[in-house]
Interface confidence: medium
């Protein structure tokens, strides 16, 4: 049985769960968010070779078509599975507001 | 106001559906599916350069990220949105069966 | 064969800094692979604190992430955990590992710390 | 989080018996479970990786199995040196995080 967890191209190397660390000003959102003044921002890198975490079945069609027509087809990317919700404290022009992001930290990992 | 949808790189150049013809030999279906004969499998393929076609707040900072630290944050993947269900025509132990995958084939497109 | 080492001080008072180095021999910590850091509160499970990658990424638990930073020294072969304003809960065996797909395949022998006045 | 649930929390045998440990995710965690044995003052060791992959130099009476959130580690035939403490983690998704151990005791 294949070993979707097995990466072909050396430990660390394929699809998981990274943190970069960021400043407001990196995000270019200094402007309208107050806290936090950092974000730990969890995404998903790594490369995806054959059926390593694939999806679903188009990522399973995707890696097959790759390899007959690599410079036609792309290899499945590493993209989130789901996400961590993250609130945010922004500015207003009454002052401030919490806003919870759904969207904004990837919480797991798989190629598609 | 920016436009999502309009690629920077040149017509046709950004992230969107394609088209890829494929037999049920080029899938590595052919021991399980007898029909159809042909596939014609719908993929997201382009670029995604700033902003184009961002599918959430996760793309907007991978963006932001990868303008900066490039060698360690990937620009986001032009990725299915949504599917088109397929029906299968299946061989199995006493004879053929159908089979409806609601996640072969992309609807449309964005990047992540 | 690859051998971790933990060391640093036994006994930190609250509010202050905990400071661990985990030496490496037998591979290299610029290689692909995660160099954790999990602990083990007396009596109780083993927590994930985080971890350092060879391209300067790092992963902390969200529930440390505030007072957690890990860092490398490849001079050394060592990676270190900080974490800051300690309090008795912190008070647990600490243990540095080795991630190489998803397994955390060798171990120091861990060190306990003391958050105590 | 995902919580790992192990049980049992604790478990006395004989050397030759079977023994089984079992672990439950608290959601799906796509056969990303890991096994292993904890000994008073030595060093961790993985036994098994990816449900069921024996990390190499462990003995083949280890086993483990498991889907979706369900998963067990079996000891076919108990030897002196396996009574121990022997916990699960899930690699699914970051944080990982750990059963509470099995503490295996000679009955």
């Known amino acids: 049985a294949r070993n979707g967890d097995h990466c072909p191209l050396g430990p660390g190397r394929c699809c998981r769960l990274h943190t970069v660390r960021a400043s407001l000003e990196d995000l270019g959102w200094a402007d309208w968010v107050l806290s936090p003044r950092e974000v730990q921002v969890t995404m998903c890198i790594g490369a995806c070779p054959s059926q390593f975490r694939a999806a679903n079945m188009h990522a399973q069609i995707k890696t097959s078509l790759h390899r007959l027509k690599p410079d036609t087809v792309p290899a499945p990317c590493c993209v989130p599975a789901s996400y961590n919700p993250m609130v945010l404290i922004q500015k207003t022009d009454t002052g401030v507001s919490l806003q919870t992001y759904d969207d904004l930290l990837a919480k797991d990992c798989h190629c598609i | 106001a920016r436009n999502g949808d309009h690629c920077p790189l040149g017509p046709g150049r950004c992230c969107r559906l394609h088209t890829v013809r494929a037999s049920l030999e080029d899938l590595g279906w052919a021991d399980w599916v007898l029909s159809p004969r042909e596939v014609q499998v719908t993929m997201c393929i382009g670029a995604c350069p700033s902003q184009f076609r961002a599918a959430n707040m996760h793309a907007q900072i991978k963006t932001s990220l990868h303008r900066l630290k490039p060698d360690t944050v990937p620009a986001p993947c032009c990725v299915p949105a949504s599917y088109n269900p397929m029906v299968l025509i299946q061989k199995t132990d006493t004879g053929v069966s159908l089979q409806t995958y609601d996640d072969l084939l992309a609807k449309d497109c964005h990047c992540i | 064969q690859v051998q971790l080492q933990e060391s640093g001080p036994g006994l930190v008072k609250p509010s202050e800094t905990l400071s661990l180095t985990c030496t490496v021999s037998?591979?290299?910590?610029?290689?692909?692979?995660?160099w954790i850091w999990i602990r083990q509160p007396p009596g109780k499970g083993l927590e994930y604190i985080g971890y350092?990658?060879?391209?300067?990424?790092?992963y902390y638990n969200p529930s440390l992430a505030s007072r957690t930073t890990i860092s490398r020294d490849t001079s050394k072969n060592q990676f270190s955990l900080k974490l800051s304003s300690v309090t008795a809960a912190d008070t647990a065996v600490y243990y540095c590992?080795?991630?190489?797909?998803?397994?955390?395949?060798?171990w120091g022998q861990g060190t306990l710390v003391t958050v105590s006045s | 989080d995902i919580q790992m649930t192990q049980s049992p929390s604790s478990l006395s045998a004989s050397v030759g018996d079977r023994v089984t440990i079992t672990c439950r995710a608290s959601?799906?965690?796509?056969?990303?479970l890991n096994w292993y044995q904890q000994k008073p003052g030595k060093a961790v060791k993985l036994l098994i990786h990816?449900?069921?992959t024996l990390h190499s130099g462990v003995p083949s009476r280890f086993s483990g199995s498991g889907s979706g959130t369900d998963y067990t580690l079996t000891i076919s035939s108990l030897q002196p040196e396996d009574f121990a403490t022997y916990f699960c983690?899930?690699?699914?998704?970051?944080?990982?995080?750990f059963g509470q151990g099995t503490k295996l005791e000679i009955k």
């Open positions: 590992a080795r991630d190489c797909d998803y397994a955390m395949d060798y």
């Open positions: 037998g591979f290299s910590i610029n290689s692909d692979c995660y």
């Open positions: 350092t990658f060879y391209s300067g990424i790092t």
């Open positions: 959601q799906k965690i796509s056969n990303y």
């Open positions: 990816y449900t069921s």
């Open positions: 983690q899930q690699g699914n998704t970051l944080p990982w995080t």
